[in-house]
Interface confidence: medium
Protein backbone atom coordinates (compact mmCIF):
# COMPACT_ATOMS: atom_id res chain seq x y z
CA UNK A 1 0.00 0.00 0.00
CA UNK A 2 1.54 3.30 -0.52
CA UNK A 3 1.14 5.77 2.31
CA UNK A 4 3.74 8.01 1.42
CA UNK A 5 2.84 11.54 0.45
CA UNK A 6 4.86 14.22 -1.39
CA UNK A 7 4.97 18.13 -0.60
CA UNK A 8 6.26 20.92 -3.16
CA UNK A 9 6.65 23.84 -3.47
CA UNK A 10 3.37 24.52 -4.89
CA UNK A 11 3.01 27.28 -6.98
CA UNK A 12 5.79 29.70 -7.43
CA UNK A 13 6.85 32.71 -9.25
CA UNK A 14 10.28 34.18 -10.56
CA UNK A 15 12.00 36.89 -12.17
CA UNK A 16 12.59 36.36 -15.94
CA UNK A 17 16.39 36.50 -16.28
CA UNK A 18 16.82 34.94 -12.67
CA UNK A 19 16.86 31.47 -11.43
CA UNK A 20 14.41 29.17 -9.22
CA UNK A 21 14.81 26.28 -6.91
CA UNK A 22 12.25 23.43 -7.70
CA UNK A 23 11.95 20.80 -4.46
CA UNK A 24 9.70 18.26 -3.25
CA UNK A 25 9.51 16.23 -0.57
CA UNK A 26 8.25 12.51 0.10
CA UNK A 27 7.36 11.70 3.72
CA UNK A 28 5.20 9.22 5.59
CA UNK A 29 6.82 6.33 3.72
CA UNK A 30 9.72 3.78 4.65
CA UNK A 31 10.32 3.33 0.67
CA UNK A 32 13.48 3.53 -0.21
CA UNK A 33 13.79 6.43 -3.07
CA UNK A 34 15.66 4.75 -6.54
CA UNK A 35 15.45 7.57 -8.43
CA UNK A 36 13.88 10.71 -9.13
CA UNK A 37 13.04 12.20 -12.45
CA UNK A 38 11.99 15.92 -12.94
CA UNK A 39 9.43 16.77 -16.04
CA UNK A 40 8.60 19.99 -17.73
CA UNK A 41 4.67 18.74 -19.13
CA UNK A 42 5.83 15.95 -21.57
CA UNK A 43 9.91 16.58 -21.49
CA UNK A 44 12.65 14.98 -19.41
CA UNK A 45 14.25 18.00 -17.71
CA UNK A 46 16.64 15.43 -15.44
CA UNK A 47 17.37 12.19 -13.70
CA UNK A 48 18.77 12.08 -10.30
CA UNK A 49 19.69 7.90 -9.96
CA UNK A 50 20.27 6.48 -6.32
CA UNK A 51 23.63 4.94 -7.99
CA UNK A 52 24.31 6.48 -11.38
CA UNK A 53 23.94 10.31 -9.78
CA UNK A 54 22.21 12.99 -12.22
CA UNK A 55 21.84 12.84 -15.79
CA UNK A 56 20.82 16.33 -17.19
CA UNK A 57 18.97 16.10 -20.30
CA UNK A 58 21.15 17.25 -23.72
CA UNK A 59 18.54 20.24 -24.26
CA UNK A 60 18.40 21.78 -21.05
CA UNK A 61 22.31 21.09 -19.90
CA UNK A 62 22.93 24.94 -20.14
CA UNK A 63 20.09 26.04 -17.71
CA UNK A 64 19.42 23.29 -15.55
CA UNK A 65 21.37 22.61 -12.50
CA UNK A 66 21.82 19.75 -10.39
CA UNK A 67 20.43 20.49 -6.47
CA UNK A 68 20.22 21.16 -3.63
CA UNK A 69 19.79 17.74 -2.27
CA UNK A 70 17.48 15.71 -4.62
CA UNK A 71 16.00 19.56 -6.23
CA UNK A 72 16.33 20.89 -9.62
CA UNK A 73 17.81 24.85 -10.53
CA UNK A 74 16.58 26.47 -13.22
CA UNK A 75 18.37 29.01 -14.84
CA UNK A 76 18.52 32.07 -16.94
CA UNK A 77 14.54 31.91 -16.78
CA UNK A 78 12.38 33.17 -19.83
CA UNK A 79 8.54 33.67 -20.41
CA UNK A 80 7.98 30.09 -21.86
CA UNK A 81 9.26 29.05 -19.03
CA UNK A 82 6.12 28.91 -17.41
CA UNK A 83 4.19 25.69 -16.46
CA UNK A 84 3.68 22.55 -14.74
CA UNK A 85 6.52 20.72 -13.32
CA UNK A 86 6.65 17.62 -11.70
CA UNK A 87 8.98 15.44 -9.66
CA UNK A 88 8.68 11.83 -10.19
CA UNK A 89 10.00 10.27 -6.95
CA UNK A 90 10.48 6.25 -7.99
CA UNK A 91 10.74 4.14 -4.71
CA UNK A 92 10.62 0.45 -3.44
CA UNK A 93 8.60 -1.33 -2.61
CA UNK A 94 5.44 1.74 -2.61
CA UNK A 95 5.86 2.39 -6.53
CA UNK A 96 5.85 5.74 -8.11
CA UNK A 97 4.82 9.03 -6.48
CA UNK A 98 4.42 12.41 -8.36
CA UNK A 99 5.00 16.06 -6.87
CA UNK A 100 3.17 19.07 -9.38
CA UNK A 101 4.70 22.71 -9.13
CA UNK A 102 3.40 25.49 -11.32
CA UNK A 103 5.84 28.09 -11.95
CA UNK A 104 5.23 31.29 -13.37
CA UNK A 105 8.13 33.38 -14.64
CA UNK A 106 7.22 37.09 -14.85
CA UNK A 107 8.62 40.36 -16.70
CA UNK A 108 7.90 42.21 -13.53
CA UNK A 109 10.74 43.15 -10.91
CA UNK A 110 8.61 42.18 -8.73
CA UNK A 111 8.14 38.12 -8.55
CA UNK A 112 6.95 36.58 -5.06
CA UNK A 113 8.40 33.51 -4.10
CA UNK A 114 5.64 31.07 -2.18
CA UNK A 115 6.24 28.38 -0.02
CA UNK A 116 8.86 27.11 2.22
CA UNK A 117 11.49 26.06 -0.38
CA UNK A 118 13.62 29.54 -1.68
CA UNK A 119 16.62 30.43 -3.48
CA UNK A 120 18.46 32.84 -0.96
CA UNK B 1 45.77 16.06 -9.62
CA UNK B 2 42.36 17.37 -7.80
CA UNK B 3 43.69 19.71 -5.46
CA UNK B 4 42.68 22.52 -3.07
CA UNK B 5 44.85 25.19 -1.62
CA UNK B 6 43.73 27.00 1.42
CA UNK B 7 45.31 30.62 2.37
CA UNK B 8 44.34 33.47 4.27
CA UNK B 9 43.71 32.21 8.13
CA UNK B 10 45.58 34.04 10.64
CA UNK B 11 44.94 35.37 14.13
CA UNK B 12 42.35 38.63 13.92
CA UNK B 13 40.74 40.42 16.61
CA UNK B 14 37.04 40.37 17.89
CA UNK B 15 34.95 42.39 15.32
CA UNK B 16 37.95 42.15 12.50
CA UNK B 17 37.84 40.70 9.19
CA UNK B 18 39.47 38.22 7.21
CA UNK B 19 39.02 36.98 3.90
CA UNK B 20 40.45 33.23 3.00
CA UNK B 21 41.13 31.82 -0.69
CA UNK B 22 40.84 28.43 -2.08
CA UNK B 23 43.06 27.95 -5.15
CA UNK B 24 41.82 24.56 -7.17
CA UNK B 25 42.88 22.72 -9.62
CA UNK B 26 42.83 19.81 -11.57
CA UNK B 27 39.20 19.84 -12.19
CA UNK B 28 37.01 22.05 -14.21
CA UNK B 29 35.94 24.15 -11.20
CA UNK B 30 32.91 26.15 -12.53
CA UNK B 31 31.28 22.92 -12.70
CA UNK B 32 31.24 21.95 -9.10
CA UNK B 33 29.26 22.73 -6.07
CA UNK B 34 32.07 24.30 -3.45
CA UNK B 35 31.91 24.60 0.49
CA UNK B 36 33.94 25.84 3.21
CA UNK B 37 33.65 23.68 6.22
CA UNK B 38 35.60 24.59 9.53
CA UNK B 39 36.18 22.89 12.62
CA UNK B 40 36.61 24.37 16.19
CA UNK B 41 39.54 22.95 18.46
CA UNK B 42 38.31 19.47 19.52
CA UNK B 43 34.97 19.69 17.92
CA UNK B 44 33.32 18.42 14.92
CA UNK B 45 32.85 19.61 11.75
CA UNK B 46 30.48 22.65 10.93
CA UNK B 47 29.42 23.60 7.34
CA UNK B 48 29.80 27.30 7.07
CA UNK B 49 28.71 28.34 3.37
CA UNK B 50 29.01 26.79 -0.03
CA UNK B 51 28.31 28.08 -3.82
CA UNK B 52 25.97 25.92 -6.32
CA UNK B 53 26.81 26.08 -9.42
CA UNK B 54 24.26 28.77 -10.56
CA UNK B 55 26.07 30.82 -8.31
CA UNK B 56 23.58 30.45 -5.53
CA UNK B 57 24.64 30.79 -2.38
CA UNK B 58 23.96 29.03 1.06
CA UNK B 59 24.91 29.74 4.81
CA UNK B 60 24.78 28.20 7.72
CA UNK B 61 22.55 30.32 10.57
CA UNK B 62 25.64 30.97 12.64
CA UNK B 63 27.30 33.09 10.04
CA UNK B 64 24.15 34.48 7.82
CA UNK B 65 25.12 38.35 7.56
CA UNK B 66 28.45 38.02 8.15
CA UNK B 67 30.17 35.79 5.66
CA UNK B 68 29.98 36.18 2.28
CA UNK B 69 31.46 32.94 -0.21
CA UNK B 70 32.30 33.79 -3.63
CA UNK B 71 34.23 32.05 -6.86
CA UNK B 72 35.99 33.52 -9.26
CA UNK B 73 35.87 30.82 -12.35
CA UNK B 74 38.40 32.07 -14.08
CA UNK B 75 40.97 32.26 -11.91
CA UNK B 76 39.59 28.55 -10.33
CA UNK B 77 39.53 30.00 -6.75
CA UNK B 78 36.80 30.21 -4.23
CA UNK B 79 36.82 33.12 -1.45
CA UNK B 80 34.93 33.12 1.92
CA UNK B 81 34.84 36.90 3.38
CA UNK B 82 34.56 36.76 7.40
CA UNK B 83 33.41 40.07 8.65
CA UNK B 84 32.79 40.80 12.64
CA UNK B 85 34.80 37.90 13.51
CA UNK B 86 33.96 36.63 16.92
CA UNK B 87 35.45 34.24 19.24
CA UNK B 88 33.43 31.08 18.58
CA UNK B 89 34.60 31.60 14.77
CA UNK B 90 38.07 30.12 15.95
CA UNK B 91 38.52 27.08 13.68
CA UNK B 92 40.11 25.49 10.92
CA UNK B 93 38.54 26.29 7.98
CA UNK B 94 38.74 23.70 4.84
CA UNK B 95 37.76 24.36 1.43
CA UNK B 96 35.56 21.47 -0.49
CA UNK B 97 34.62 20.26 -3.28
CA UNK B 98 31.34 18.52 -4.19
CA UNK B 99 31.32 15.05 -5.75
CA UNK B 100 31.00 14.51 -8.88
CA UNK B 101 28.00 12.26 -9.07
CA UNK B 102 25.48 13.24 -6.49
CA UNK B 103 26.60 16.74 -6.12
CA UNK B 104 26.85 16.63 -2.32
CA UNK B 105 29.54 14.34 -1.03
CA UNK B 106 32.52 16.43 -0.46
CA UNK B 107 34.81 14.23 -2.22
CA UNK B 108 38.23 16.42 -1.98
CA UNK B 109 38.93 18.78 0.81
CA UNK B 110 42.28 21.24 1.29
CA UNK B 111 44.40 20.80 4.55
CA UNK B 112 42.50 23.53 5.97
CA UNK B 113 43.87 26.95 7.26
CA UNK B 114 43.72 28.22 10.80
CA UNK B 115 41.97 31.27 11.86
CA UNK B 116 41.95 32.38 15.30
CA UNK B 117 39.93 35.43 16.55
CA UNK B 118 41.34 36.79 20.16
CA UNK B 119 42.13 40.26 21.67
CA UNK C 1 22.74 22.83 16.66
CA UNK C 2 23.53 19.75 14.24
CA UNK C 3 19.97 18.25 12.23
CA UNK C 4 21.61 14.79 12.05
CA UNK C 5 22.52 12.61 15.54
CA UNK C 6 25.37 10.24 15.77
CA UNK C 7 26.37 8.19 19.07
CA UNK C 8 28.96 10.33 20.39
CA UNK C 9 31.85 7.15 20.94
CA UNK C 10 31.93 3.20 19.36
CA UNK C 11 34.50 0.52 20.11
CA UNK C 12 35.22 -2.64 18.49
CA UNK C 13 38.51 -5.12 18.62
CA UNK C 14 40.45 -5.91 15.56
CA UNK C 15 38.76 -8.45 13.26
CA UNK C 16 35.04 -7.20 14.54
CA UNK C 17 32.49 -5.25 12.56
CA UNK C 18 30.94 -2.22 13.85
CA UNK C 19 28.21 0.01 12.95
CA UNK C 20 27.53 3.45 12.93
CA UNK C 21 24.45 5.03 13.06
CA UNK C 22 23.00 8.73 12.03
CA UNK C 23 19.07 9.98 12.02
CA UNK C 24 17.60 12.72 10.97
CA UNK C 25 14.39 13.83 9.86
CA UNK C 26 12.52 14.03 6.07
CA UNK C 27 14.38 17.87 5.23
CA UNK C 28 17.31 15.56 5.03
CA UNK C 29 18.29 12.19 5.18
CA UNK C 30 14.69 11.24 4.31
CA UNK C 31 14.67 12.81 1.05
CA UNK C 32 18.20 13.54 0.43
CA UNK C 33 21.10 11.17 -0.18
CA UNK C 34 23.86 10.68 2.92
CA UNK C 35 27.39 10.29 2.64
CA UNK C 36 30.16 9.36 5.45
CA UNK C 37 33.86 11.21 5.99
CA UNK C 38 36.86 9.64 7.76
CA UNK C 39 39.30 12.44 10.21
CA UNK C 40 42.31 10.44 10.92
CA UNK C 41 43.67 12.54 13.98
CA UNK C 42 45.21 15.61 12.72
CA UNK C 43 44.16 15.18 8.91
CA UNK C 44 41.61 16.99 6.31
CA UNK C 45 38.39 14.69 6.54
CA UNK C 46 38.00 12.26 4.12
CA UNK C 47 35.28 10.97 1.87
CA UNK C 48 34.25 7.27 2.57
CA UNK C 49 30.68 7.03 1.41
CA UNK C 50 28.41 8.99 -0.98
CA UNK C 51 25.46 8.33 -2.39
CA UNK C 52 23.96 6.40 0.81
CA UNK C 53 26.30 3.18 -0.31
CA UNK C 54 28.50 4.24 -2.73
CA UNK C 55 32.49 4.03 -2.20
CA UNK C 56 34.59 6.13 -3.63
CA UNK C 57 37.77 4.37 -5.68
CA UNK C 58 40.70 3.57 -3.35
CA UNK C 59 38.28 2.98 -0.20
CA UNK C 60 38.36 -0.70 0.97
CA UNK C 61 34.90 -2.79 0.68
CA UNK C 62 35.27 -3.54 4.72
CA UNK C 63 33.21 0.03 4.51
CA UNK C 64 29.63 -0.03 3.73
CA UNK C 65 26.84 2.71 4.14
CA UNK C 66 22.84 1.98 3.91
CA UNK C 67 19.89 3.95 4.56
CA UNK C 68 16.19 3.43 5.28
CA UNK C 69 14.24 5.90 6.02
CA UNK C 70 15.58 9.07 7.54
CA UNK C 71 18.38 6.41 9.12
CA UNK C 72 21.36 6.42 7.72
CA UNK C 73 24.47 3.87 8.51
CA UNK C 74 28.03 2.77 8.17
CA UNK C 75 29.46 -0.61 8.66
CA UNK C 76 32.84 -1.09 8.87
CA UNK C 77 33.82 -4.70 9.08
CA UNK C 78 37.25 -6.50 9.72
CA UNK C 79 38.00 -3.42 12.14
CA UNK C 80 41.76 -2.70 12.06
CA UNK C 81 44.14 -0.45 14.01
CA UNK C 82 44.25 2.20 11.43
CA UNK C 83 40.14 2.68 11.30
CA UNK C 84 40.67 4.62 14.60
CA UNK C 85 39.07 8.06 13.98
CA UNK C 86 36.45 10.41 13.81
CA UNK C 87 33.44 9.93 10.95
CA UNK C 88 30.93 11.86 10.42
CA UNK C 89 27.47 11.82 8.26
CA UNK C 90 26.42 14.63 6.24
CA UNK C 91 23.31 15.52 3.90
CA UNK C 92 21.66 17.99 2.41
CA UNK C 93 19.08 19.77 4.48
CA UNK C 94 15.88 21.11 2.82
CA UNK C 95 14.05 23.38 5.27
CA UNK C 96 17.69 24.98 6.31
CA UNK C 97 18.62 25.17 2.72
CA UNK C 98 22.31 24.10 3.82
CA UNK C 99 24.78 21.08 4.41
CA UNK C 100 24.58 19.24 7.79
CA UNK C 101 27.00 17.22 9.40
CA UNK C 102 26.39 14.56 12.49
CA UNK C 103 28.20 15.59 15.72
CA UNK C 104 30.93 12.84 14.77
CA UNK C 105 31.20 9.41 16.48
CA UNK C 106 34.84 8.81 18.12
CA UNK C 107 35.94 5.30 17.00
CA UNK C 108 38.55 3.51 19.31
CA UNK C 109 40.10 0.29 18.42
CA UNK C 110 40.90 -1.79 21.25
Known amino acids: MMTGTIETTGNISAEKGGSIILQCHLSSTTAQVTQVNWEQQDQLLAICNADLGWHISPSFKDRVAPGPGLGLTLQSLTVNDTGEYFCIYHTYPDGTYTGRIFLEVLESSVAEHGARFQIP | EVQLLESGGGLVQPGGSLRLSCAAS????????MSWVRQAPGKGLEWVSG???????YYADSVKGRFTISRDNSKNTLYLQMNSLRAEDTAVYYC?????????????WGQGTTVTVSS | QSGLTQPPSASGTPGQRVTISCSGD????????VSWYQQLPGTAPKLLIY???QRPSGVPDRFSGSKSATSASLAISGLQSEDEADYYC???????????FGGGTKLTVL
Open chain 2, 96 to 108: AKGHTVLQYGMDV
Open chain 2, 26 to 33: GFTFSSYW
Open chain 2, 51 to 57: IHISDST
Open chain 3, 26 to 33: ISNTRNNY
Open chain 3, 51 to 53: GNH
Open chain 3, 90 to 100: GTWDNTLNAWV
